[in-house]
Interface confidence: low
């Protein structure tokens, strides 16, 4: 079972959180965007999205970097920085951002009702839209065996998540994705077809991506990727507003 919480698209850019926690490797991020008929955004595309109101409080992959787009300064989101904040120490798993070239130029909150480029597979994939509607598909999108293979839980795998919020400058609600802290059950590997036994959370330690670029701010992992505890319950099925956890 894989749950993919997605946000509205801003200039084609959107945020994807998997299974309510930082659990996407760089290779899986590319595969995931591809499944959405999208690509990892470039820095320029992310900056364009920022300019039309896109901000979150979650680290996610773009092409070459791990970033948080920030419009309003917030001490618990990218350490009060604004702009496209780059995480300079990225050796872990994060969320991802994707870019859909055919999306409207500004904001698009229509529900996603397909994962067009997923292929046949045994996994139940649920797309959770900002309005709470769900699209369920059985299939697979990962191609890197390390993203599929059995993995071992670490502290990061059970860390709490935080809000992915829509900017108040675009005049709307705050959208919070909800993260549940829970241990990873042992897995037998990709040959398992019972999706209830499959909650991959493999680490991609081999990846290291440089930071840098214009119109950006930089930070180390400690600048915002901290662990927190759950502040409250969550309504994961109805309405766009979800109770946040301590943002990372």
């Amino acid at each position: 079972q894989i749950d993919l919480n997605i946000t509205c698209r801003f200039a084609g850019v959107f945020h994807v959180e998997k299974n309510g926690r930082y659990s996407i490797s760089r290779t899986e991020a590319a595969d995931l965007c591809k499944a959405f008929n999208s690509t990892l955004p470039t820095m320029a595309q992310m900056e364009k999205a920022l300019s039309v109101g896109f901000e979150t409080c979650r680290y996610g992959f773009i092409e070459g970097h791990v970033v948080i787009p920030r419009i309003q300064p917030n001490s618990i989101c990218a350490a009060n920085h604004t702009g496209v904040y780059i995480l300079t120490s990225n050796t872990s798993q994060y969320d991802t951002y994707c870019f859909n070239a055919s999306a409207p130029p500004k904001e698009d909150c229509t529900s996603v009702t397909d994962l067009p480029n997923a292929f046949d597979g045994p996994i139940t994939i649920t797309i959770v839209n900002p309005d709470g509607t769900r699209y369920i598909k059985k299939g697979e999108y990962r191609t890197n065996p390390e993203d599929i293979y059995p993995s071992n839980p670490t502290d990061d795998d059970v860390s709490s998540g935080s809000s992915s919020e829509r900017s108040s400058t675009s005049g709307g609600y705050i959208f919070h994705t909800f993260s549940t802290a829970h241990p990873i059950p042992d897995e037998d590997g990709p040959w398992i077809t019972d999706s209830t036994d499959r909650i991959p959370a493999t680490r991609d330690q081999d990846a290291f991506y440089p930071s840098g670029g214009s119109h950006t701010t930089h930070g180390s992992e400690s600048a915002g990727h901290s662990h927190g505890s759950q502040e409250g319950g969550a309504n994961t099925t109805s309405g766009p507003v979800r109770t946040p956890q301590i943002p990372e």
């Epitope: 897995e187 037998d188 990709p190």
Partner: antibody, heavy 117, light 108 residues
């Protein structure tokens, strides 16, 4: 740099046991499962099983079930594969492997186990 | 278990030529969970391709993989001297993980 370094060659008599070690470095040992694969002379590669290095849980190929035991020592970042009731057809090179990564699939250098009376 | 049959057993080619290696599975390989390895004498296998068609980091683009279901192909577009080796396919979609018997690519 991710590296898996295995113990040296062994010569064993039929019926004996052998224990091969695999020391990992360059990554967090408990974050990845470790697999064991063997290759008899001129034969195809054979998967033996794997261990969840975090909790110690194992999964073995049916062919080796009951004869193979895979363990790990997290403090030493080392995985072990013990094969018992050795027979001549167990003569092979035994590899530990951290399946997989888009940046490569780290394998140990291999340990030759010779079973001979 | 899934049995992987590789053909041909030996491929005799010259540097610069194109090599096409086949791997056929006895039953469908789930979600294209298929990898290709290169092995040289006295060395451990080296991962070339995973997910049937994704190249591992550092693998030259002359190596490409294709196929799904039961039929998979590894293509080396232009053989270099260092490419002469044994190539194995492996499925990791069902237990036990299994390997093909290998194709030896030798210099003609």
């Amino acid at each position: 740099q991710v590296q898996l370094v295995q113990s040296g060659a062994e010569v064993k008599k039929p019926g004996a046991s052998v224990k091969v070690s695999c020391k990992a470095s360059g990554y967090t040992f408990t974050n990845y499962a470790m697999h064991w694969v063997r290759q008899a002379p001129g034969q195809r590669l054979e998967w033996m099983g794997w261990i969840n290095t975090g909790n110690g849980n194992t999964k073995y190929s049916q062919k080796f079930q009951g004869r193979v035991t895979i363990t790990r020592d997290t403090s030493a970042s080392t995985a072990y594969m013990e094969l018992s009731s050795l027979r001549s057809e167990d003569t092979a090179v035994y590899y530990c492997a951290r399946f997989y990564s888009g940046s490569g699939s780290p394998w140990g250098q291999g340990t030759l186990v010779t079973v001979s009376s | 278990e899934i049995v992987l049959t590789q053909s041909p057993g030996t491929l005799s080619l010259s540097p610069g030529e194109r090599a096409t290696l086949s791997c056929r599975a006895s039953q469908s390989v789930s979600s294209s969970y298929l990898a290709w390895y290169q092995q040289k004498p006295g060395q451990a296998p080296r991962l070339l391709i995973y997910g049937a068609s994704s190249r591992a980091t550092g693998i030259p683009d002359r190596f490409s993989g294709s196929g799904s279901g039961t039929d998979f192909t590894l293509t080396i577009s232009r053989l270099e001297p260092e490419d002469f080796a044994v190539y194995y396919c492996q499925q990791y979609g069902s237990s036990p993980l299994t390997f093909g018997g290998g194709t030896k690519v030798e210099i003609k």
